[in-house]
Amino acid sequence: DVNEAPQFSQHVFQAKVSEDVAIGTKVGNVTAKDPEGLDISYSLRGDTRGWLKIDHVTGEIFSVAPLDREAGSPYRVQVVATEVGGSSLSSVSEFHLILMDVNDNPPRLAKDYTGLFFCHPLSAPGSLIFEATDDDQHLFRGPHFTFSLGSGSLQNDWEVSKINGTHARLSTRHTEFEEREYVVLIRINDGGRPPLEGIVSLPVTFCSCVEGSCFRPAGHKHHHHHH
C-alpha cells in the first residue's frame, strides 16, 4: 500500500471578483482530498503581490490587501495541498483570480503636452487638439469622455469642444493674448459608474516665432508647433 499525495478536485481553480472588494473578503476556495483519508493543509505559493491568504484548514482564499485589475488580471497563484501527518506528501494546483473592472481611474492626458505654443501676436484665433485616456477597461466601445474648461475664469479666453470620445479641441476665443505661458485647466469626465473626473493642465505658450518655432535665447531648445 503506497502512500499517495493529495488530489485536487480541479487542475485550475478560477474565481471572479470585483477589484474593489473589501479586505478580508472571501474570493474563492480550493478543495483536495487525500487518498488515505488524512486531513489536508493548504498553503499559497507565488503570491507575489501579497494580495491573498488561504485558510490552511478549509482551503478558502481571502483578500488581505486592495486588489487592482490594472496591475494585471487574472492574478495567478499556486495552491499547495499537504497531507497532515503521514509522509507530508503534497500536490500543487493553480488558482486564477479574475478581477472585474471598477471605474477607479480618473481620466488623464494621453501624452505629454508640454511645448504647446502659438506664435505671438495671433493673427487669427487658433486651436490645438489633445487626447485623453484612462486605465480602466472599456468593453465593446472606447471611452466616452466629455470635456469642459476647468474654471469659469478661463471662458473669456478659451473654449473646448469635443471631437470624439477621446479627443477634444482647445481654441482661443480672441487674439489678444500676452507673450507668456498660459496654463489652461481642462476638466475630463469619463461618464462611468461612478463617473470620475480628472482636471488636467495644458500649458500653452504665446511666443515670438522664428521660422514657425518659438524663439528662445541660445541654450534653450525650440518648441514644436502644435496648432
Epitope: D39, S41, S43, H56, V57, T58, E60, T82, V84, S88
Partner: antibody, heavy 117, light 108 residues
C-alpha cells in the same frame, strides 16, 4: 491515551502578554492540526485559530489575528499561543484542541487567564 | 462569518422525555462539518456528534443528530440524568469556525 496538557492559570496586568502551552501525549503533534478556543461566560466559545505543526501553516480568526500568535515546538510535542496587549476582555479560559476532519476530538483542560491591575 | 443560533437557550426535561435542540446558521453549512459538543460545568467540551449525525466514541445511542443547509438538530430520545450539560453546535464549513451560544439541558 491521547491527551493535551495545558499550562496553569495566569494572572496578568492589562497591556501585558501571556504565553500558554499545550503539550500533546499519546500521539505525535505533527499528525493533526491544533486549534485554540476562548471561552467566556458572555461570549461562549470562540475559535481563535489553528496551526498545522508539521509545517507551521496557520489560520486565524480575523478578530484575533493582530494579537494572537500560534507556534509549535515539535521536539517537545508542544503547541503555544501568545496573546499580546491584554485587556479585561481577554479574561477567559483558553482551550487547545486537536482536530481530525475539522472536528475537535481531543481537548485540553483549559488555561484560565485573568487580566487585572 | 457564519453565525450559529441555538434554541432554546435552556431546556428542562424529566427523565425519559424526548428533547430536541436546534442550531440555525446564517448561511448554508456543509453537513460534513457540523458538530455538537457536550460540556459539563468545570470541564472542557467533549465531542458528541460529528458530521451532523455521527456519534462520537462512547456517546449513548439515545442521541441522534440530523439536518442540512442552515438548520440542524440534536435529539435525545429518552433523557437521563447524566445528560445534564450544555450542548454547543459548531460549524467548520467556512472559516472562521463558529460555535452556537449553547443549549443548557436541565433535568427535573
Amino acid at each position: 491515551e491521547v491527551q493535551l496538557q495545558q499550562s496553569g492559570a495566569e494572572l496578568v496586568r492589562p497591556g501585558a502578554s501571556v504565553k500558554m502551552s499545550c503539550k500533546a501525549s499519546g500521539y505525535t503533534l505533527t499528525s493533526n492540526n491544533i486549534h485554540w478556543v476562548k471561552q467566556t461566560p458572555g461570549q461562549g466559545l470562540e475559535w481563535i485559530g489553528a496551526i498545522y505543526p508539521g509545517n507551521g501553516d496557520n489560520s486565524y480568526n480575523q478578530k484575533f489575528t493582530d494579537r494572537a500568535i500560534l507556534t509549535v515546538d515539535t521536539s517537545s510535542n508542544t503547541a503555544y499561543m501568545q496573546i499580546s496587549s491584554l485587556t479585561s476582555e481577554d479574561s477567559a479560559v483558553y482551550f487547545c484542541a486537536r482536530s481530525f476532519r475539522r472536528y475537535f476530538d481531543v481537548w485540553g483542560a483549559g488555561t484560565s487567564v485573568t487580566v487585572s491591575s | 462569518d457564519i453565525k450559529m443560533t441555538q434554541s432554546p437557550a435552556i431546556v428542562s426535561a424529566s427523565p425519559g422525555e424526548k428533547v430536541t435542540m436546534t442550531c440555525r446558521a446564517t448561511s448554508s453549512v456543509s453537513s460534513s462539518y457540523l458538530q455538537w459538543y457536550q460540556q459539563k460545568p468545570g470541564s472542557s467540551p467533549t465531542l458528541w456528534i460529528y458530521s451532523t449525525s455521527n456519534l462520537a466514541s462512547g456517546v449513548p445511542s439515545r442521541f441522534s443528530g440530523s439536518g442540512s443547509g442552515t438548520s440542524y438538530s440534536l435529539t435525545i430520545s429518552s433523557v437521563e440524568a447524566e445528560d445534564a450539560a450544555t450542548y454547543y453546535c459548531q460549524q467548520y464549513s467556512s472559516s472562521p469556525s463558529t460555535f452556537g451560544s449553547g443549549t443548557k439541558l436541565e433535568i427535573k
